[in-house]
């Protein structure tokens, strides 16, 4: 029987007695920055090249005895998880190891930086196929380590890192907090977040997805044929590095943005028990467990989108929060969320030649989050159309007036502290799907995009009585690009996208009171690209 | 996942024109910043990554490193350049006393300085 972790990441069509999906990452080189490794272990022999790179601090303690098997343990196991003959994810991938962690599993930011620089120089000297860099380590937040990861990612390298084993917000650690890195948390056989002693997997908005990371069988450095069970977010990251190698081997031209979107798209959704996470982190933490795509080709036709949460704005009156998409992604919509409900909405604005999503805190508010919907839309031309507050009873409205432009998202932003507490709700006139409608005291922002074959439609779900959560989902074949609430009244905490579902959260029912003011409508904008579908069919 | 994450310590050392009379003073209005790990036991004081501005060439990095050593020596401090970065980030790794940070932050081309810190297997 195959180990539970390999079964978990394998789509049913691959499941046989032996885990042998096609094309095991043979076109890809995976760099491992870790401890030394036992390269003659039968799991990884001939698959891992040990580079001459070594930059490690001395071991702590006068009584420390270097024992080869202990020094090699972490790295050997991870190399086995990525590419091991029996228990590896990408059995065809070749690996190169750099020693940046000592026999106690400790390294330095500077040593890691020099290691990343070594990889970049190797890439320049001898360009090969796609590169994946596995960083199964974590330290405190480091501006310089995050910057180095950003530069390497922009040079076309896919970086995968451990979220950290501190049962804490991954944004407080590096390289986990680097936006360009794929950050991986750990789950177990029951799809629960992994507990490790008194701690466990990190969580939060800096985690991209989770992967198997408890009781993972892999190569043991105790002997050349030994196996052992190890656990941690390093093991989880190794699974994702292996999956990335498989995907890149099947589609070597994939960009980092495309790869990340595919990893998210093919993940198992909503299987993690979120009760394990601190309450304030649940909404920010992706409920995704990594899996291999069911087919190595043919995913190109889909419109891929993901949700990116900003850092918390902080509680000051004029505080704002900004969410950004990756360089190759389009910001198709922008929403905001505040636990206290005190916010002044959100807007899309240009920053450094790119659209960003900015959310505004309100007086007395505990702070806000900006939520960006970031999508892969080749040849897109997007712009934001704004209507200032209308001061008319019909409310503020704005539409996409340019020929061939479709509405992908609506945002609203207001300067008044308490928007429409005693105002009747504003409803969209039927048959006008290409416009955003909002409160008369709010300015409304429409995200309008033109892209070959792009079509969008609006889907609403309204609930007359107060409810803590209203959702509306896009149907199969359509992708959620926009998520907002109608009306923009004060009891709405905000709106955000979870996979293909638009979620609108309201204040606790018990405090709202059942008035007409309680009516909440979730508005989803669902899009698809016929152009991408046609291009995909032509390829096949 | 942003550089703005606030829960790590940022020490901004204000720059004043001092006795050194630098040939190339930092551009007006830009202040180099100092960063260190918020988790005290993980800090490695005495080793610093000096990050230079994005377009700085290798030769300028080497020159800046040498200038730091010379100015430190004039003050009676020993420094050791452990590595000069190029390829990913321009800058250098230096072993020196924390007393020299204010001096280092005033060097030309300096964007920020980060104290080295530990990373751990996960």
């Amino acid at each position: 029987s195959i180990p539970w972790n390999l079964e978990r990441i394998t789509p049913p069509r691959y499941r046989a007695d032996e885990y042998q999906p096609p094309d095991g990452g043979s076109l890809v080189e995976v760099y491992l920055l870790d401890t030394s490794i036992q390269s003659d272990h039968r799991e990884i022999e001939g698959r891992v090249m040990v580079t001459d790179f070594e930059n490690v601090p001395e071991e702590d303690g006068t009584r420390f005895h270097r024992q080869a098997s202990k020094c090699d343990s972490h790295g050997t196991h991870l190399a086995g998880v990525v590419s091991g003959r029996d228990a590896g994810v990408a059995k065809g991938a070749s690996m190169r190891s750099l020693r940046v962690l000592n026999c106690q599993g400790k390294g330095t930011v500077s040593g890691t930086l020099i290691g990343l620089e070594f990889i970049r120089k190797s890439q320049l000297v001898q360009p090969v196929g796609p590169l994946v860099v596995l960083l199964p380590l974590a330290g405190g937040y480091s501006r310089v380590l995050n910057a180095a990861c950003q530069r390497l990612a922009r040079a076309g390298v896919v970086l995968v890192t451990a979220a950290g084993n501190f049962r804490d917000d991954a944004c407080l650690y590096s390289p986990a907090s680097a936006p360009e890195v794929i950050t991986v948390g750990a789950t177990n056989a029951q799809d629960q977040p992994v507990t490790l002693g008194t701690l466990g997997t990190n969580f939060g908005r800096c985690v991209d997805l989770f992967a198997p990371g408890e009781d993972i069988i892999g190569a043991s450095s105790d002997c050349s044929t030994c196996f052992v069970s190890q656990s941690g977010t390093s093991q989880a990251a190794a699974h994702v590095a292996g999956i990335a190698a498989m995907m890149l081997s099947a589609e070597p031209e994939l960009t980092l943005a495309e790869l990340r979107q595919r990893l998210i798209h093919f993940s198992a959704k909503d299987v993690i028990n979120e009760a394990w996470f601190p309450e304030d982190q649940r909404v920010l933490t992706p409920n995704l467990v990594a899996a291999l795509p069911p087919s190595t080709h043919g995913a190109g036709w889909q419109l891929f989108c993901r949700t990116v949460w900003s850092a918390h704005s902080g509680p000051t009156r004029m505080a704002t929060a900004v969410a950004r998409c990756a360089p190759d992604e389009e910001l198709l919509s922008c929403s905001s969320f505040s636990r206290s409900g005190k916010r002044r909405g959100e807007r899309m604005e240009a920053q450094g030649g790119k659209l960003v999503c900015r959310a505004h805190n309100a007086f007395g508010g505990e702070g806000v989050y900006a939520i960006a919907r970031c999508c892969l839309l080749p040849q897109a031309n997007c712009s934001v159309h704004t209507a200032p507050p209308a001061e008319a009873s019909m409310g503020t409205r704005v539409h996409c007036h340019q020929q061939g432009h479709v509405l992908t998202g609506c945002s609203s932003h207001w300067e008044v502290e308490d928007l429409g507490t005693h105002k009747p709700p504003v409803l969209r006139p039927r048959g006008q799907p290409n416009q955003c409608v909002g409160h008369r005291e709010a300015s409304i922002h429409a995200s309008c995009c033109h892209a070959p074959g792009l079509e969008c439609k609006v889907k609403e779900h309204g609930i007359p009585a107060p409810q803590e959560q209203v959702t509306v989902a896009c149907e199969e074949g359509w992708t959620l690009t926009g998520c907002s609430a109608l009306p923009g009244t004060s009891h709405v905490l905000g709106a955000y996208a979870v996979d293909n579902t638009c979620v609108v959260r309201s204040r606790d029912v018990s405090t709202t009171g059942s008035t007409s003011e309680g009516a909440v409508t979730a508005v989803a904008i669902c899009c698809r690209s016929r152009h991408l579908a046609q291009a995909s069919q032509e390829l096949q | 996942q942003e550089d703005e994450d606030g829960d790590y310590e940022e020490l901004v050392l204000a720059l004043r024109s001092e006795e050194d009379g630098l040939a190339e003073a930092p551009e007006h209005g830009t202040t180099a910043t100092f960063h260190r790990c918020a988790k005290d036991p993980w800090r490695l004081p005495g080793t610093y990554v000096v990050v230079l501005k994005e377009e700085t060439h290798l030769s300028q990095s080497e020159r800046t490193a040498r200038r730091l050593q010379a100015q430190a020596a004039r003050r009676g401090y020993l420094t050791k350049i452990l590595h000069v970065f190029h390829g990913l980030l321009p800058g250098f790794l230096v072993k020196m006393s924390g007393d020299l940070l204010e001096l280092a932050l005033k060097l030309p081309h300096v964007d920020y300085i980060e104290e080295d810190s530990s990373v751990f297997a996960q």
């Epitope: 202990k70 490790l196 002693g197 408890e214 069988i217 105790d222 030994c226 052992v228 069970s229 | -």
Partner: antibody, heavy 130, light 107 residues
């Protein structure tokens, strides 16, 4: 599904010897510590011995130290218990069991997280009698 | 060596009852405790590990709690299949000891 099958039990005189074997399937066998546990007729469970994945560490209950030897052969996916100087009180059903546990990094070294004996064989009977 | 003491030795109960079995360690074992169920002529079966974690495939009516020296196994609503003998087991530095067992029988 991992399966454990014990063999080698039987009737032996006091002072005699027996070698118990436990055959396992798959790489999951060699990935964990393994234990022998016994149960005397009508009595409770008693842990006898265990062995690390590579055989480098072994532990025994006091009552069998110096008489019993636990070993394993990774190539054959087998666990053994060599029992010498047998006594009447060694009469029991002997089970081999997998000790599921995992190692994780913390505080500058590996920590061991133990789950328990999650896979057991059907047992083999050892009777020590004259 | 650490001794494990289970109580009661025998427990009579009816289907639908909530039952609790206690296990005491002679010294602190943190949370390193497992619970097993054994039926006559069969090998034991792992129910709970690390004092409170439910083993995969075990019904949720079984739960464990405690740390240090006092531990309990609770069956929230007894089912006919639950009548068996239950053992606690401590893990400490790679050597183990079991409790003497609690026989759960039909009233």
């Amino acid at each position: 599904e991992v399966q454990l099958v014990e063999s080698g039990g039987g009737l032996v005189q006091p002072g005699g010897s027996l070698r118990l074997s436990c055959a396992a399937s798959g790489i999951t066998f060699s990935s964990y510590w393994m234990s022998w546990v016994r149960q005397a007729p009508g009595k409770g469970l008693e842990w006898v011995a265990n062995i690390k994945q590579d055989g480098s560490e072994k532990y025994y209950v006091d009552s069998v130290k110096g008489r019993f030897t636990i070993s394993r052969d990774i190539a054959k996916n087998s666990l053994y218990l060599q029992m010498n100087s047998l006594r009447a009180e060694d009469t029991a059903v002997y089970y081999c069991a997998r000790d599921r546990g995992t190692y994780y990094y913390a505080d500058g070294g590996y920590n061991y997280y133990y789950y328990g004996m999650d896979v057991w064989g059907q047992g083999t009977t050892v009777t020590v009698s004259s | 060596d650490i001794q494990m003491t289970q109580s009661p030795s025998t427990l009579s109960a009816s289907v639908g009852d909530r039952v609790t079995i206690t296990c005491r360690a002679s010294q602190s074992i943190s949370s390193w405790l497992a619970w097993y169920q054994q039926k006559p002529g069969k090998a034991p079966k792992l129910l709970i590990y690390k004092a409170s974690s439910l083993e995969s495939g075990v019904p949720s009516r079984f739960s464990g709690s405690g740390s240090g020296t006092e531990f309990t196994l609770t069956i929230s609503s007894l089912q006919p299949d639950d009548f068996a003998t239950y053992y606690c087991q401590q893990y400490n530095s790679y050597s183990y000891t079991f409790g003497q067992g609690t026989k759960l029988e039909i009233k």
